[in-house]
């Protein structure tokens, strides 16, 4: 009789362990679903807000024609500035025309005043040629005014309404550029 009771007790304990496991699995599953739901809601929220505010440029970016510009609030060396822009899906500013240069310098005057801002221009160490980061040559009117006396790599920056050159390892603010979103209307 005692043996029978202890067998039943063991079976009941086993059942209880299985139920606890099942409950644990269910709780985990429920938590996972809740997380997925949260993620989906966040994703939908983002998609909806982008659909509603389908503004051509992200918040805190300035628009001019087909471009969006971001003026940094931190200093960094030229290469790090480039990487910071890439993280935002943009590149360092590439000035294509006098009109664009005027827009940038005018905007900087309004925002911050006379500081140095890296742009996507660097000097080839061998040939001494200035090239934009995409490999294209600047138009003649958009070449840095002074040749830097640096033995290190030389990069371009904007200050006031001038394009100048400096050792790429110096710390400056920077300007990122990306294409503005085209309106689907």
């Amino acid at each position: 009789k005692l043996l029978q009771v202890s067998t039943i007790a063991m079976q009941q304990q086993e059942k209880l362990i299985q139920q606890e496991r099942a409950l644990l699995n269910f709780t985990e599953w429920k938590r996972s679903c809740a997380l997925q739901m949260k993620y989906c809601q966040a994703f939908m929220q983002n998609s909806l807000s982008s659909a509603h505010n389908s503004s051509p440029c992200p918040n805190n970016w300035i628009q001019n024609r087909e471009s969006c510009y971001y003026v940094s609030e931190i200093w960094s060396i030229w290469h790090t500035s480039q990487e910071n822009c890439l993280k935002e899906g943009s590149t360092l500013l590439q000035i294509e025309s006098k009109e664009e240069m005027d827009f940038i310098t005018g905007s900087l005057r309004k925002i911050k005043g006379s500081y140095d801002y890296w742009v996507g221009l660097s000097q080839d160490g061998h040939s001494g040629r200035w090239l934009w980061q995409d490999g294209s040559s600047p138009s003649p009117g958009l070449l840095p005014a002074e040749r830097s006396q640096s033995a290190n790599q030389v990069c371009g920056y904007v200050k006031s309404n001038s394009l100048l050159s400096s050792n790429c390892s110096t710390w400056k603010y920077f300007i990122c550029e990306k294409y503005a979103l085209r309106s689907s209307v």
């Epitope: 993280k87 899906g89 590149t91 490999g135 990306k178």
Partner: nanobody, 115 residues
Framework: QVQLQESGGGLVQPGGSLRLSCAAS????????MGWYRQAPGNQRELVAA???????VYGDSVKGRFTISRDSAGNTVHLQMDSLRPEDTGVYYC?????????WGQGTQVTVSS
């Protein structure tokens, strides 16, 4: 979590060409730009080329005019066409995905330019 898989490395003669590919999987919606870096023995990793989601491109000074970066229409594979290769292009080429938060690196693929 973004995973990156590089392919296309190998041994090539000076003046030759190679095409590297990098396929991204995982959280690809968070990727804003993708690029290639290289590291020669004893040197730091340097940016070779990068491309943003919008198609803007960036090249390292030493490869301008010789290398071309592009991405497929789906946007999750990036290609690096390397022409007029030189011995100094030898190194391990790493793919990198840029996001607002973390950046992700591939395992690297060896490129050797030698006669």
């Amino acid at each position: 979590q973004v995973q990156l898989q590089e392919s296309g490395g190998g041994l090539v003669q000076p003046g030759g060409s190679l095409r590297l590919s990098c396929a991204a999987s995982g959280g690809i919606s968070s990727i804003n730009s993708m690029g290639w870096y290289r590291q020669a023995p004893g040197n730091q990793r340097e940016l070779v080329a990068a491309i943003t989601n919008g198609g803007r491109t960036v090249y390292g000074d030493s490869v301008k005019g010789r290398f071309t970066i592009s991405r497929d229409s789906a946007g999750n594979t990036v290609h690096l066409q390397m022409d007029s290769l030189r011995p100094e292009d030898t190194g391990v080429y790493y793919c990198k995905a840029f996001t607002r938060g973390d950046d992700y690196w591939g395992q690297g693929t060896q490129v050797t330019v030698s006669s």
